[in-house]
Every structure is written in structure tokens, then in C-alpha cells.
Interface confidence: low
Amino acid sequence: GPAKSPYQLVLQHSRLRGRQHGPNVCAVQKVIGTNRKYFTNCKQWYQRKICGKSTVISYECCPGYEKVPGEKGCPAALPLSNLYETLGVVGSTTTQLYTDRTEKLRPEMEGPGSFTIFAPSNEAWASLPAEVLDSLVSNVNIELLNALRYHMVGRRVLTDELKHGMTLTSMYQNSNIQIHHYPNGIVTVNCARLLKADHHATNGVVHLIDKVISTITNNIQQIIEIEDTFETLRAAVAASGLNTMLEGNGQYTLLAPTNEAFEKIPSETLNRILGDPEALRDLLNNHILKSAMCAEAIVAGLSVETLEGTTLEVGCSGDMLTINGKAIISNKDILATNGVIHYIDELLIPDSAKTLFELAAESDVSTAIDLFRQAGLGNHLSGSERLTLLAPLNSVFKDGTPPIDAHTRNLLRNHIIKDQLASKYLYHGQTLETLGGKKLRVFVYRNSLCIENSCIAAHDKRGRYGTLFTMDRVLTPPMGTVMDVLKGDNRFSMLVAAIQSAGLTETLNREGVYTVFAPTNEAFRALPPRERSRLLGDAKELANILKYHIGDEILVSGGIGALVRLKSLQGDKLEVSLKNNVVSVNKEPVAEPDIMATNGVVHVITNVLQPPANRPQERGDELADSALEIFKQASAFSRASQRSVRLAPVYQKLLERMKH
């Protein structure tokens, strides 16, 4: 058969939960301390909460059935009677009473024809302000007759026909009634919730609703123009040109900021937005939802997208509606011909209308922002340049911040990209130019996206002119080639000599993408003498071992994930892993990761890696070779190899360093 509507699915779930109590029994959730009852969906059933309030489960006859004395459940179908009597069956006795007062209406409800009545519950009538009720029952009850006729449709309409966003023609001056049928199974009629639906009568159907509904005369724009509390909003809408949309056809929800909401924002910020057509349009669009959302439809947190594209979390807490967890809705369900308005007393400023400063203030990067300000870069973060700010997380600075000197200023300038980027468009190998004049590289890995040594730690925040990338560490731009890096650090003097001996200098100086696991002098000194002599006595073997320390792509620590098998220039793979923030290669910890170079990255290690073929199965007693013996071997080898003869002085240097 046809797909069930959300309402029918929820009813089916309630029936399922109630079946152990007999046929046609529905489980109903009642909010403790209120008379609010709901057929229960799966999520609510397990959470036992509606709008954050605890509920109790009761079991009632499903719509259209009744109990039979002495029998389990609700085995009997309710007898069909006319509409007037069915009002009594559903408990809408006040509607019956007011129908009697009109004189004309009862004969209609008892007579031939086919009608639908959206009947307010007794509580709904009782909650009307006294002056409203008085006005209904005065004037020879003509107002009452009109009001009741507005609750009626001149044909039978069952819930499976009540589609989201449809309008029904009422029996009062053919005025429209707005229907919304939400995915959670809640159905509203002019934002009044259907409590008991589809009660058949011989001449139609009765739906019990939780409010007395009234005609809708104004569109959203007209309501904005009438209400004093929307003075600022009115000016903003006029300036943005959105009034055409807000007075046109469609179904929108306007989260309408009151004057008070605008007053909470500093004038400078507000006027920056009001004076910027694009930011203003984004601001206003962030208060508009693409469909009408009545308050009664919200029974738990719900993600909704605004016209601006931002996702808002609409929820509820008791009787209060919340936006992003805050109870800022002061007046709800003001109906318009083209949607619904909820008054809010706090402005929802989207990222797209914010400066970089404002974006950063809401992120975990305040320490970095202070540094940018102290370094005199504040103007870039609040101006109209198209920029991307690479801001390290506060946790990066847990051990303190650097002094603001020329070096730090330059470093910070290299955290600002001269373009407004979006991470989703970044690609591997892309270069980005900084305010400091550096070219930074983009590395795309399976589970991370990195710029040089620093990886993106949170979703981008795209502002009016600038985008904020939250980064997991301070970014260090490359200062030279891998060879330059190694030569410039006296921890690697022995490695540099070995690289020169092995003829790999040119490789590590030219353009390329290398990951170099760089053993320190200590690592070389720690080699068993036999290994050391073997290494230094054979230029080919030395080259082989050193190539095993060089991966054929750039792998920064943020790109490792759990385990990466990195192909080395020697041919075998290196097992690189990250555990508890410690990088390891072949299970040996890296002492210092991510020293960036223009043609690669250097990771400092305190041991020399052995390719699989070279790893001894067991280490017996090695010869306690002295440095002199190693040198003899190197010299002997050099006589057999012209290339080694050329490099003998380098070996000598290497051996001399090993003595110390």
C-alpha cells in the first residue's frame, strides 16, 4: 500500500508498545506535571523525555476504539454517530456547548453532508483570555459562529491527506488553514497540535487540537511593519531588499530579532553589518528557515538549516523553545499567511557576517589571537582583506607563549594566507602564499589535512572576508632544503658526513618530496661497532641504509593516523605509527618530529634504522672495533673503489667525530 505518513508511523509505534495490554491499546507519554500527552516514537520511548521533561507512560484506547467491560484492551470500535455527538466522544464538550449557542451550527453538524472539524480541547477553550471569550459570545454569537466555522472544512479530511505545508479552505469566508505534518509525527493546524485524530463520524471526521485557532490575515513583512518591537529589523529588512521575499508566497519561519536583540550588540559591530549589504543579507537570512516550523513540532533537539546556510539547533526545555541551547525565544507561533514568526531577543550572527576577530573569539584560539594583536597584526583580522588565518589551539601554548620579537612577528605573519580559503577546496601539493611572503604546502592525508607541519583541528569558520582554520600546532615554514636543515643543526654532523659519503647530497638538495628520519650523532655513536664498521666501510651499503631512512613522500606527524607504511628510497617500507601523540618508526620513538624543509620533512631519531634484510636475527658477541680499525676498513675499501677513494677524507672526518 501507500507509504505511511509520519503521524501514522508514530501511532503504529504507540500501538506496538501497547499491544501487551490488549488489542487497540496505544502507549501514550504524558509530561509530568502537565496534561500534555503524546503518542510515542522510538526515540522518546527510550529517552522517556519530552522537551527535557520526564514523562510517564499510560495506556489508552487507540483512536476509534473503546473498552468492553470484562475484556482486555479496547476490542470494540466506537459506534459511529454524527459530528456533534462525536465532539462529546473525543472530549470536546466545550465545543459542543458553543455549537449549541450559535443555534445554526448544530443542525449542520447533525445533518447530511461531509465535514471535518478541528475541535479545540476543553483546556484550549479555557486558556483563552477572558476578553477574547467575551468578544466571541457577544454580538448575538455571530463571532462565535464565525470562529467555529473557521475550525471546519467542507469535506472529510483524514490525517493521511494532511501534508506538510498544505492549506485547507475553511468554512469561514473560505479562509485558509495552514497544515504542517512533521517528520516526528506531529501534525499542526495553524500551529495547534493534533491531539486525537481521525475520529470518524457519520457525516465527517473530528480531530481534537490543543488551541483555538483564528484567521491569518497578514504576511510576515506586514507583521514586521506593524510591530513596534521590530523597528530595527524593519530598517534592516528594507535596506537588504528582503521585504519582497517576506511578503511573497512561500512558507518560512522568521526568527525575528526584537529591538532588544539588536541593542545587545555593540554599535560598532552592528553598524559594520548594517553598512555592508552582503553581511546584512547573511545576517537576516540566518534568521529565516526554509519552511514553517511551529513550536508544537519541537519535542527534542532538531537541526535546521537557515537560508544563509548555517545549521541551528532548535530544541525545547519545558514550555520554552531554545536555539543552540539558549532560551531566547520570547514569543512563539505568530502566524502569517506565508509562514510563522518567533520573536527572539538575541541576534543570531552567522559566521559569514563576522570578522576574523569575532570568529576567533568563539573558538579555542584566544591565546593565538592575543599574539597576533600584540604583534601588530590586529588590523588584518578586522579589516576587509580576503585572508585565511591559521590559528593554533590554546592547548598548543600550554607551556607559555613566545616573546613578541621580530622572529615571532614574522612567524605570525606566516600564519596568515593571502586569500580566503575553504579547506574543502584544498588539494595535495597546493601552495599558499602568506603575508610573510612564504609559500606553504598543503598535504592531504586519509584522515587529516595539513599545511606544512600543522593540521586542521576543527571545521573552518568562514567569515565575511576571512576564514579561520583552527590548527593543531604552531606552523613552521621551511627554511631551506633537507640538506640545509641537517647542515644547520650540529646534532646531525655525522649524518651530513654520511650523506656526503654516500653521494646523496644532491638528492636531498634538489626539489622533491622526502620524509627523512634523521639519526643524531648519538644514534651513530650508539651503533654496535660491527654495524658501524660495515656501514662506513661500504659506500654502497651506506647509501642503501641511508636511503632506507628516506620516505618517497612527505609525511608529517598529523598525517600518520594510527599506522602508515611509507615506501623508502631503498625499496622497503617503513612502518610509521602514532600513539599517545608519539610518532614511532619501526616501533622506535621519534625524538622530534616535523622539522620542515622546502623539499621534505625531517623527523629526528636516536637510532639508526636497519632495513629488513640487514636486521640480525640475534646479536652475538661483536668485535669491539676501535675507531682506528673502522678507518682501516674504510681505507682498505677505498683502495678498491675510486669513488670511495674520493670520499676517504669525509670518512676520516666521520671517524674523528665518532671518537668524541
Epitope: A235, S267, E268, T269, R272, A361, E362
Partner: antibody
């Protein structure tokens, strides 16, 4: 350099009206927020009204709301303050002030002021 | 409305000495989204219009001598003249531009002792 020259001050009876003008030069008038600030004799400064660069947004102190109207004519580089239903407490030197930039801000440049005396 | 209160009402300082005056707002002028304080300081000499000295609570307007400095955050602010000169005799006003209506302090009159 920025020049702001106020005119239109004078003596007026309570209930009367005056229109102050401020001729601006030395900057692009249409790019700046403009303000009127007043100072009663021997007293402190009081902000009176603001107008945005495009003239859309106007703000008034409660003490003048409904009686004073701020406006601007960018073709003439002139700021105006129409003052109706004047009261004795409106007696003050009225300064024409330029904002810092095209956004609402602090009071960056001040004219020499024009004196308004409301007296019977 | 945000009320601005300056202290002292008047201040007499010897030439070359440090002059310090305070300004307190009835609510915070620090906007968390950009970490800026919406406060300005002005100097008014007799018979002249006010002149902008400081904005954002601590940023000196160009052309203002560096003996003038502003400090403070939130609700408490200070204007300091590190070495008083004869031409500094004036009334000094603080002003908030965090929220309309923009309001000034009542002023601090600075004289030479």
C-alpha cells in the same frame, strides 16, 4: 585636512525651531558616520544624534527624540540638525562631529561648535 | 543606559609629574567576540572643542604625544599622562561607544599644582 563648520545657531524662544548646518570638507563626506554632540554652559558633553554614512540609520538621545531630526545631503557635503519644540535645557554649544570611518565609532574630528540659546 | 563615572572631579599635579585619572562604567565595555574595549578619551581646553586622544581604551590617536596612555578593561579604565606639560591643562572626558545612547563621564579637570 578635515574641516567641519557649524552654522545656524542663535537665540530662540521656548517652543521655537532652529536648523543647524555643518559644512564638511577635506574628506569624502559620504564615507563617514556623522554626529551632533552638545555641551550646556559649564557642563559636560552629551551625545545628541547619529546618522549613518548612507543616511539610512539614525539614532537620537532620549532627551531630543521626537523633537530633533538629523539628516545629511551628500551632494552638498552638509549635515543638518532640525530642532523643533526647543526648551531651555537645549541651550548649549552644538558640535558637528565626524566618525572614524564608514562604521559607527568614536568621535574623531570636531567642529568649533555653534551656540544655541533658548530663552524667553 | 551605561553610566560613566570619572574620578577625581579635579586633579592638581606639578609640571613633569605623572597625572592619573579614572573612568568607571556601569557595565562592561569589553566585547568578548573581538576582545576590544569600547572606550575613548577626549581632551577639552577652555574655549575649544574636544579632541580625541585615545580609542579602544588604549590606542593613541595619531599625533597625540606618547606621554598620554590609556589602560584598563571591562569596567575600569585609566588615562595617564606620564610627565605633565603646561599645555595639558584641560578637562578630560571618557566616553563609551559600546551601546546607544553614547555617554560621557562628567569630566576630570586637570590643573597645575
Amino acid at each position: 585636512q578635515v574641516q567641519l563648520v557649524e552654522s545656524g545657531g542663535g537665540v530662540v524662544q521656548p517652543g521655537g525651531s532652529l536648523r543647524l548646518s555643518c559644512a564638511a570638507s577635506g574628506f569624502t563626506f559620504s564615507d563617514y558616520y556623522m554626529y551632533w554632540v552638545r555641551q550646556a554652559p559649564g557642563k559636560g558633553l552629551e551625545w545628541v544624534a547619529t546618522i549613518s554614512d548612507g543616511g539610512i540609520y539614525k539614532y537620537y538621545a532620549d532627551s531630543v527624540k521626537g523633537r530633533f531630526t538629523i539628516s545629511r545631503d551628500s551632494s552638498k557635503n552638509t549635515l543638518y540638525l532640525q530642532m523643533n519644540s526647543l526648551r531651555a535645557e537645549d541651550t548649549a554649544v552644538y558640535y558637528c562631529v565626524r566618525g572614524w570611518d564608514r562604521y559607527d565609532s568614536w568621535f574623531a574630528s570636531w567642529g568649533q561648535g555653534t551656540t544655541v540659546t533658548v530663552s524667553s | 543606559d551605561i553610566v560613566m563615572t570619572q574620578s577625581p572631579d579635579s586633579l592638581a599635579v606639578s609640571l613633569g609629574e605623572r597625572a592619573t585619572m579614572n573612568c568607571k562604567s556601569s557595565q562592561s565595555l569589553l566585547y568578548s567576540s573581538n576582545q576590544k574595549n569600547y572606550l575613548a578619551w577626549y581632551q577639552q581646553k577652555p574655549g575649544q572643542p574636544p579632541k580625541l586622544l585615545i580609542y579602544w581604551a588604549s590606542t593613541r590617536e595619531s599625533g597625540v604625544p606618547d606621554r598620554f596612555s590609556g589602560s584598563g578593561s571591562g569596567t575600569d579604565f585609566t588615562l595617564t599622562i606620564s610627565s605633565l606639560q603646561a599645555e595639558d591643562v584641560a578637562v578630560y572626558y571618557c566616553q563609551q561607544y559600546y551601546r546607544y545612547p553614547y555617554t560621557f563621564g562628567q569630566g576630570t579637570k586637570l590643573e597645575i599644582k
